[in-house]
Interface confidence: medium
């Protein structure tokens, strides 16, 4: 047993042009609240699947009224933590869904109007008992900054909250006539001794002598920032100089999906999954009812009688999406092996194989690498009827015989220092900068100013961007 805790630090317009001035519609004032939903595992789950680990709702925030011609202020947030108790073992891997809802307070026919402003979905690994993990996420034109952690409660301990402690003063036997006690461990308040040198801040252990890393850190002693880190598991004011990495720019950067649409990367492009009521490449078309014919590809539209009612598209076989706008992509399962090109012909799938491979799914290797050798620990890669070497870090050239320095091109901006290590290069950024190449300036009030355990927000405190 334990509790998952989420602290919202700020919610507001993201950087860049086109950011909304106000969360409220033109109909009057509004206020915000947040819903957190936890689902087990890292797999993609249907949007309708329940929050099997639990869900929680914040209080409603203070009333916000847009001031014409005034700069958009920070949005007033609800106070305190969102807490989701979990009854069973903490799974370690989970999906975190944070929704920002608004309540419109103008005159509403039939009671308050509730609408979703933004939804953030993150799949995460997190050990119970670890430090606060931080994240900054964009949803449409909005930006959400938050911290979260999982901690055990009652007598539970361990990274999954599954081991039970007996308080040292407790008797060791069950009372007469009672069933046998659950197995308890004596003196389990004393943590196991981790491997010598294991990072106290970024590593942990459940068994003596091991060293397991929090997300964002790697290496035998959890001292190396992982190249895929999203600044999770960092504490204190030094996060801007720890070499914390932010994923490089991708098709979903820059908020291409409007109106709370969620962006997913596709090869060389992006795809927006739009909330109901919006469609278009970037979810830019809104105010839609069945009268507008929003269901594509022969989808059947079902909606309410009044103009404010939402609609549902019932899609014919072969199509999906809130507006039946997406053809079911059987190639997304990547049935063609070894880099083969997948073609969905409607009646069948076909794989167009790269040179050196054959078979219905390109599964047969014509063995370009036979008798070839790559020096200095490089590995031979089949393809194109010829071999290619994938070289170990620090080597290059056709056969990996030439030394290469990944830091030679000075990839770290703004005075950042470059370090080469086994999984790539790492930039240790100068104070005031962050990002995988130190390309992003930290906001003046910066993430680095966060305390180790963010305090609850007190009524009347001005909410500042981090």
């Amino acid at each position: 047993a334990g509790v998952f805790e989420l602290q919202i630090h700020s919610f507001g317009p993201g950087p860049g042009p086109g950011a909304p001035r106000s969360p409220c519609s033109a109909r009057g004032p509004c206020r915000l609240f947040f819903r957190v939903c936890l689902k087990p595992g890292l797999s993609e789950e249907a949007a309708e699947s329940p929050c099997a680990l639990g869900a929680a709702l914040s209080a409603r925030g203070p009333v916000y009224t847009e001031q014409p011609e005034a700069p958009a202020p920070d949005l007033p947030l609800p106070n305190g933590l969102l807490q989701v108790p979990f009854r069973d073992a903490w799974p370690g891997t989970f999906s975190l869904i944070i929704e920002t809802w608004r309540e419109e307070l103008g005159d509403q026919i039939g009671g308050p109007a509730w609408s979703l402003l933004a939804r953030v979905t993150r799949r995460r690994r997190l050990a119970a008992g670890g430090p606060w993990a931080r994240d900054i996420q964009r949803a449409g034109a909005w930006e959400l900054r938050f911290s979260y952690r999982a901690r055990c409660e009652l007598l539970a301990v361990g990274t999954a909250c599954t081991r039970l402690c007996r308080p040292r003063s407790a008797p060791s036997r069950c009372g007469p006539g009672l069933r046998p006690c659950a197995p308890l461990e004596d003196e389990c308040e004393a943590p196991p001794v981790c491997r010598a040198g294991c990072s106290l801040e970024h590593g942990f252990c459940e068994q003596p002598g091991e060293c397991r890393c929090l997300e964002g850190w790697t290496g035998p002693l959890c001292t190396v920032p992982a190249s895929t880190s999203s600044c999770l598991g960092l504490r204190g004011p030094s996060s801007a100089t720890t070499g914390c990495l932010v994923p490089g720019p991708g098709p979903c950067d820059g908020n291409p999906c409007a109106n709370g649409g969620s962006c997913s990367e596709t090869p060389g492009s992006f795809e927006c999954t739009c909330p109901r009521g919006f469609y278009g490449l970037r979810c830019e078309v809104s105010g839609v009812t069945c009268a507008d014919g929003p269901c594509f590809n022969g989808g059947l539209c079902v909606g309410g009688a009044d103009p404010d009612s939402a609609y549902i598209c019932h899609c014919p076989p072969g199509f999906q999406g809130s507006n039946c706008e997406k053809r079911v992509d059987r190639c997304s399962l990547q049935p063609c092996r070894n880099g083969g090109l997948c073609l969905d012909l409607g009646h069948a799938l076909r794989c167009r194989c790269r040179a050196g491979f054959a078979g219905p799914r390109c599964e047969h290797n014509l063995d370009d690498c036979a008798g070839r050798a790559c020096a200095n620990g490089g590995t031979c890669v089949e393809g194109g009827g010829a071999h290619r070497c994938s070289c170990a870090l620090g080597f290059g050239g056709r056969d990996c015989r030439e030394r290469a320095d990944p830091c030679a091109a000075r990839p770290c901006a703004h005075g950042g220092r470059c370090y080469a290590h086994f999984s790539g290069l790492v930039c240790a950024c100068a104070p005031g900068y962050m990002g995988s190449r130190c390309e992003f300036p930290v906001h003046p009030d910066g993430v680095s100013a966060l305390p180790a355990a963010p305090p609850g927000l007190r009524p009347g405190d001005p909410q500042r961007y981090l």
Epitope: A47, E48, G54, L57, L116, R119, N259, G304, D308
Partner: nanobody, 128 residues
């Protein structure tokens, strides 16, 4: 798969009371809304009462306001409908429904098409 099982229906005299229960196979606190609907013979299914966001918002149809109360016990994953001062026109099959979200951006808790999981129903008969 989410399963909803209703119970508590039956026959009662006008002015009497019944309490319907809806047991869910998953956390009811996970839902956007849990609702009660009814369908009389030859009529369309209509919304009776709904509770959204674990009780932050409740909605009632005008015809039952002041007589029916919806409540939720998250520990038991059960939603209740307390029906007082029953009238013959309340006679119908009563259904429990759960809305676990479809990437929606609105709440319309008394519209049947907003819900994606339904129970089998329990019959309520009110005689005069």
């Amino acid at each position: 798969e989410v399963q909803l099982v209703e119970s508590g229906g039956g026959s009662v005299q006008a002015g009497g009371s019944l309490r319907l229960s809806c047991a869910a196979s998953v956390y009811t606190s996970s839902s956007y809304c849990m609702g009660w609907f009814r369908q009389a013979p030859g009529k369309e299914r209509e919304g009776v009462a709904a509770m959204c966001f674990g009780g932050l918002v409740t909605h009632y149809a005008d015809s039952v306001k002041g007589r029916f109360t919806i409540s939720q016990d998250n520990a038991k994953n059960t939603v209740y409908l307390q029906m007082n001062s029953l009238k013959p026109e309340d006679t119908a099959m009563y259904y429990c429904a759960a809305d676990f979200g479809r990437d929606k951006n609105y709440l319309r808790p008394l519209l049947p098409h907003a819900y994606n999981y339904w129970g089998q129903g329990t019959q309520v008969t009110v005689s005069s």
